[in-house]
């Protein structure tokens, strides 16, 4: 709700940092609850960026006060269930405007980190976050999108015709029409042979299997090389020199070391911790986060996972970290969404990747025979006759400033204006009284309407 | 699933305005650009010009500049491409593609046939 | 404006065969400040809309197979298709997206 510096922390100061205009928006970042600030840095539930943006402008001597912030929201589609307890990181950008605002355009001012236990469904929960001599106001909830529902929208309800034995206000839920509520929804990949759940995103192993998706046999489990398989409550004896000694990778998979563990990538038509599965079909799904499965309708045709923005793999397993590419230019700050990759351009730039330089004339035409016109670092049209707006793409009224004068009626024409002269007067703008004895005519003194000249529209 | 789906297709007369259409599902509409290409036969792809949907800024290629203008409407998810002053020339198909930072045009429309016939 | 010419305009292969194909644009396309190159390479078959395959000048977009290989840097482009299949039938588009957008003619790629 409002954003600004911390009580009690020295000389209060503006968000603005007294150079001049400035405008706030605010990144936020979904992680899950059990992850590590230092290991995991995507945003794996979801992220997204402020819209509404208001201009601040700073007053010298004003006293430095908490900003107000818009009302609009900050919407973050997240995958999958709602996991209930995640890690919430709010970034707070600082974009520098006016054209001595010298240093940075762009500054992260504050990023605050948290760990939030939330169920869907729920009312607003509010919260004060201080990080250095910042302080951010703000609320936050989770809510389901129809038709999932629940405290984890892990549950599908759709409106059924058939009678219910259901408590009032709850629908029953497909696909079990004697239901009220449908079964909790796994971690995507959980094995439905080896693994089950009884919470959202969780993945229990049946006796005989292990792993995050208990696609591994305990037999095998995770010990490599020289290391054997010891109680099911000690793991793995005699610790190898490294997670990718012998290649644990079945089926042509290739090993990477990760953080003192192992990923396979697997070839096409293989997944698995180690590349096991095989024979996997697109009924089984194995196409993770979001990503389309193409062909392999039966065990023996590969199938093909066409991945969504920002991830790759060939199950589109791996989370890719775009803004590292750097692809806005012209000064421009690299914001991943989640979904899709936006540059927030100085002022002057625009365009996917901020190409487009709005000052300069080489950059953007004007249009209907407007001539562009370069002048103190910026750039305007100057438009033709009967046309007007930034690039002279509205149809002016050349009439509008009623330039007829003594009377005359003002009518538009594809060429500008023409004035129709009430009697006595003459002239391209009625501007001459007509002397009766045939003399010349003279200017005449203005009688209500005044005289003006051609207008243009800039 | 991501689609841009666009309005069928139109005869219009010389001379005369039409509007195309390009509803968007799947995807934040505000996060993307929506760009409108011309593809006559045998004459390749022609780029007409962007718009942001997050401000309804537009940049054209300056030969489109007096012919096309692009606008957008964030509550239907829909950007339009409006067409002026039609000749034989205008006979085309007009497809609508989406463009993030990362990925150029991603995604395309099934495109819409335009013929311009007295 | 920046212009992008492609050749050839149109070449015929046997299934299994080797093609490449070239695409040069009239200024630099390599963006200083992060070493990339701003072109794209798009696939339409007769009757469909382009779809992308290639972007950042090499980086081969999901689900595209590994046959089509992209390469260059700074005006000189090259789309390679290391053993050509009969779904390839299509023509081939480049596309600048360093300054406005501009599209190269189009390479027509026939089976024998």
């Known amino acids: 709700h409002s954003f600004g510096p911390g009580p009690g922390l020295g000389t209060p100061r503006s968000p603005c940092n007294a150079r001049g205009p400035c405008r706030l928006f605010f990144r936020v970042c979904l992680k899950p609850g059990v992850s590590q600030e230092a290991t995991e840095s995507l945003c794996a539930l979801g992220a997204a960026l402020s819209t509404s943006v208001p201009v601040y402008t700073e007053h010298p001597g004003e006293s430095a006060a908490a900003l107000p912030l818009p009302d609009g929201l900050v919407r973050v589609p997240f995958r999958d269930a709602w996991p209930g307890t995640f890690s919430l990181v709010i970034e707070t950008w600082r974009e520098q405007l006016g054209e001595h605002a010298g240093g940075p355009a762009w500054n992260l001012l504050a990023r605050v980190v948290g760990r939030r236990r939330l169920a869907a469904g729920g009312p607003w929960a509010r919260d004060v976050q201080r990080t250095g001599t910042w302080e951010l106001h703000f609320s936050y909830r989770a809510r389901c999108e129809p038709p999932a529902v629940g405290a984890a929208c892990a549950r599908l309800c759709r409106s059924r015709s058939a009678p219910s034995r259901c408590g009032p206000g709850l629908r029953p839920c497909t696909p079990f029409p004697d239901e009220c509520e449908a079964p909790s929804v796994c971690r995507p990949g959980c094995s439905p042979e080896h693994g089950y759940c009884e919470e959202p995103d969780e993945c229990r192993c049946l006796e005989g299997w292990t792993g995050p998706l208990c696609t591994v046999p305990v037999s095998t489990s995770s010990c490599l090389n020289s290391r054997v398989p010891g109680p099911a409550s000690t793991g793995c004896l005699l610790p190898g020199p490294g997670p990718c000694d012998g290649n644990p990778c079945a089926n042509g998979g290739s090993c990477s070391e990760t953080s003192g563990s192992f990923e396979c990538a697997c070839p096409r038509g293989f997944y698995g911790l180690r590349c096991e599965v095989s024979g996997v079909t697109c009924a089984d799904g194995p196409c993770f986060n979001g990503g389309l499965c193409v062909g392999g309708e039966d065990p023996d045709s590969a199938y093909v996972c066409h991945c969504p923005p920002g991830f790759q793999g060939s199950n589109c397993e791996k989370r890719v970290d775009r803004c590292s590419l750097q692809p806005c230019q012209n000064g421009g700050l690299c914001l991943d969404l989640g979904h899709a990759l936006r540059c927030r351009c100085r002022a002057g730039f625009a365009g996917p990747r901020c190409e487009h330089d709005l000052d300069d004339c080489a950059g953007r035409a004007c249009a209907n025979g407007g001539t562009c016109v370069e002048g103190g670092g910026s750039r305007r049209c100057s438009c033709a006759l009967g046309f007007g707006g930034r690039d002279c793409r509205e149809r002016a009224d050349p009439c509008a400033s009623r330039p007829c004068a003594h009377g005359g009626r003002c009518y538009a024409h594809f060429s500008g204006l023409v004035c129709a002269c009430a009697p006595g007067y003459m002239g391209v703008r009625c501007e001459f009284a007509v002397r009766p004895d045939g003399a010349d005519a003279v200017p005449a003194a203005p009688r209500g309407l005044r005289q003006a000249d051609p207008q243009r529209f800039l | 699933e991501v689609q841009l789906q666009q309005s069928g297709a139109e005869l219009v007369r010389p001379g005369a305005l039409v509007k195309l259409s390009c509803k968007a599902s799947?995807?934040?509409?505000?996060?993307?650009?929506i760009h409108w290409v011309k593809q006559r036969p045998e004459l390749g792809l022609e780029w007409i010009g962007w718009?942001?949907?997050?401000?309804?800024?537009?940049i054209y290629d300056p030969k489109f500049q007096d012919k096309a203008s692009i606008t957008a409407d964030t509550s239907s998810n829909t950007a339009y491409l409006h067409l002026s002053s039609l000749t034989s020339e205008g006979t085309a198909v007009y497809y609508c593609?989406?463009?993030?930072?990362?990925?150029?045009?991603?995604?395309w429309g099934q495109g819409t046939l335009v013929t311009v016939s007295a | 404006d920046i212009v992008m010419s492609q050749s050839p305009s149109s070449l015929a292969v046997s299934v299994g065969e080797k093609v490449t194909m070239r695409c040069k644009s009239s200024?630099?396309?390599?963006?200083?400040?992060?070493?990339?190159?701003?072109l794209a390479w798009y696939q339409q078959k007769p009757g469909q809309s382009p779809k992308l395959l290639i972007y950042w000048a090499s980086t081969r977009e999901s689900g595209v197979p590994d046959r089509f290989t992209g390469s260059g840097s700074g005006t000189d482009f090259t789309l390679t298709i290391s053993s050509v299949k009969a779904e390839d039938l299509a023509v081939y588009f480049c596309?600048?997206?360093?300054?406005?957008?501009?599209f190269g003619g189009g390479t027509k790629l026939e089976i024998k």
């Open positions: 593609a989406s463009e993030d930072a990362y990925y150029p045009f991603a995604y």
């Open positions: 799947g995807f934040n509409f505000k996060d993307y650009y």
């Open positions: 596309q600048q997206y360093y300054s406005y957008r501009t």
């Open positions: 200024q630099s396309l390599l963006y200083s400040s992060n070493q990339k190159n701003y």
């Open positions: 718009i942001d949907p997050e401000n309804g800024n537009a």
